[in-house]
């Protein structure tokens, strides 16, 4: 098995992930593993020398970088919060704070905004990934209601009056629950007509 450094006439290396082509010497050299950087470049007689990233810096990939990237905190002003810390092999992982969605994306989320309210009679469609997009409000399905303007309220099933030993006084809508009454209670005058029919 050939180990770096080795000559390459076609400018390609056997292991693209862990080796790179050095055009000046026309050789393949080792990349440095995640968490390290190149402290001494390779030559025809000596392979790449790697050193560990200093604290608060990282390199995520096999690389031939001469520096490590600086760890950056999640910016709360931009609505971001940390979900996993920066280490020598990985940058800080951020996500939108609860109640927010990613409004600006450049390889990763850079800015979060408040989720829109869903009006009464609707709820936010459930997403695969929290914080990925703004709310898409969908109507409550039959037999359910939601009576507030909220980014997170869910449609609830209408109360079943009979389960509580009551009778229905007014049916539920998408925006209101069923109204129940005691069977012994008389109907209000404006509803007495419907009883006669």
């Amino acid at each position: 098995q050939v180990v770096p450094p080795y000559g390459s006439e076609n400018q390609t290396c056997r292991d693209q992930e862990k080796e790179y082509y050095e055009p000046r010497h026309r050789i393949c050299c080792s990349r440095c593993p995640p968490g390290t950087y190149v402290s001494a470049k390779c030559s025809r007689s000596r392979d790449t020398v790697c050193a560990t990233c200093a604290e608060n810096s990282y390199n995520e990939h096999w690389n031939y970088l001469t520096i490590c990237q600086l760890c950056r905190p999640c910016d709360p002003v931009m609505g971001l919060e940390e979900i996993a810390p920066c280490t020598s092999k990985r940058k800080t992982q951020c996500r939108c704070q609860p109640g927010m969605f990613c409004a600006a994306w450049a390889l990763e989320c850079t800015h979060c905004e408040l989720l829109s309210d869903c009006p009464p009679g609707t709820e936010a469609e459930l997403k695969d990934e929290v914080g990925k997009g703004n709310n898409h409000c969908v109507p409550c399905k039959a037999g359910h209601f939601q009576n507030t303007s909220s980014p997170s309220a869910r449609c609830q099933p209408h109360t079943r009056c009979e389960d509580q030993g009551l009778v229905e006084a007014a049916p539920g809508t998408a925006q209101s629950d069923t109204t129940c009454r005691n069977p012994s209670e008389s109907l209000p005058p404006e509803m007495s007509g419907t009883m006669l029919m």
């Epitope: 995640p34 604290e55 608060n56 995520e60 996993a84 810390p85 920066c86 020598s88 092999k89």
Partner: antibody
Framework: EVQLVESGGGLVQPGGSLRLSCAAS????????MSWVRQAPGKGLEWVSG????????NYADSVKGRFTISRDNSKNTLYLQMNSLRAEDTAVYYC??????????????WGQGTMVTVSS | DIVMTQSPDSLAVSLGERATINCKSS????????????LTWYQQKPGQPPKLIIY???TRESGVPDRFSGSGSGTDFTLTISSLQAEDVAVYYC?????????FGQGTKVEIK
């Protein structure tokens, strides 16, 4: 040769204190995070505490928070664990472990032989 | 905290046969930016400290025999010993290092049948 050697274990009464040490050799100590991992008799592994290479970042398992303190002296290549208000459930072999990283959140590539801590009256 | 669950708790395998240990994490430990799973496997022989054998779910630590292999991604992982040897008798632990605190599985004891 890369090596970690723990010391300071022993028998202590509930409520007592103990200070564990871990002497490191064979690598640039200040470049790497270190952790304490414990193993109760016949049980599995439990991460106890970690400290970054410079000593600037520390973290603790909920079970020891407020009672244990991790520290390091990079000039002496030594890691410490100060254990106060010890309980019977702290009885375990305590290992010091090196991370392949300046942050303790990584694979533990080197382990010491461990030191036994017994908390009993 | 991320909970790691191993199965089975113990395993008896004949010499030269395959041993398979599973590890499931309660949360995803795959980091999409570098496509790495932040999961390791350790081997602990009686009376000894644990020894790192696999990191990033599938990369063998130097000096570890190639009969040991790791696979899986996201939340489901496997350690395979392709042909069990007498010196492989040990307890094997998985561990995630995706998020603080790092957490271990409960261990799987591998014995010879």
């Amino acid at each position: 040769e890369v090596q970690l050697v723990e010391s300071g274990g022993g028998l202590v009464q509930p409520g007592g204190s103990l200070r564990l040490s871990c002497a490191a050799s064979g690598f640039t100590f200040s470049s790497y995070a270190m952790s304490w991992v414990r193993q109760a008799p016949g049980k599995g592994l439990e991460w106890v505490s970690g400290i970054s290479g410079s000593g600037g970042r520390t973290n603790y398992a909920d079970s020891v928070k407020g009672r244990f303190t991790i520290s390091r002296d990079n000039s002496k290549n030594t890691l410490y664990l100060q254990m106060n208000s010890l309980r019977a459930e702290d009885t375990a072999v305590y290992y010091c472990a090196k991370s392949d990283n300046w942050h303790y959140l990584d694979a533990f590539d080197i382990w010491g032989q461990g030191t036994m801590v017994t908390v009993s009256s | 905290d991320i909970v790691m669950t191993q199965s089975p708790d113990s395993l008896a395998v004949s010499l030269g046969e395959r041993a398979t240990i599973n590890c499931k994490s309660s949360q995803n430990v795959l980091y999409s930016s570098n496509n790495k799973n932040y999961l390791t496997w350790y081997q602990q022989k009686p009376g000894q400290p644990p020894k790192l054998i696999i990191y990033w779910a599938s990369t063998r630590e130097s000096g570890v025999p190639d009969r040991f292999s790791g696979s899986g991604s996201g939340t489901d992982f496997t350690l395979t010993i392709s042909s069990l040897q007498a010196e492989d008798v040990a307890v094997y632990y998985c561990q995630q290092y995706f998020n603080t605190p790092p957490t271990f599985g409960q261990g799987t004891k591998v014995e010879i049948k």
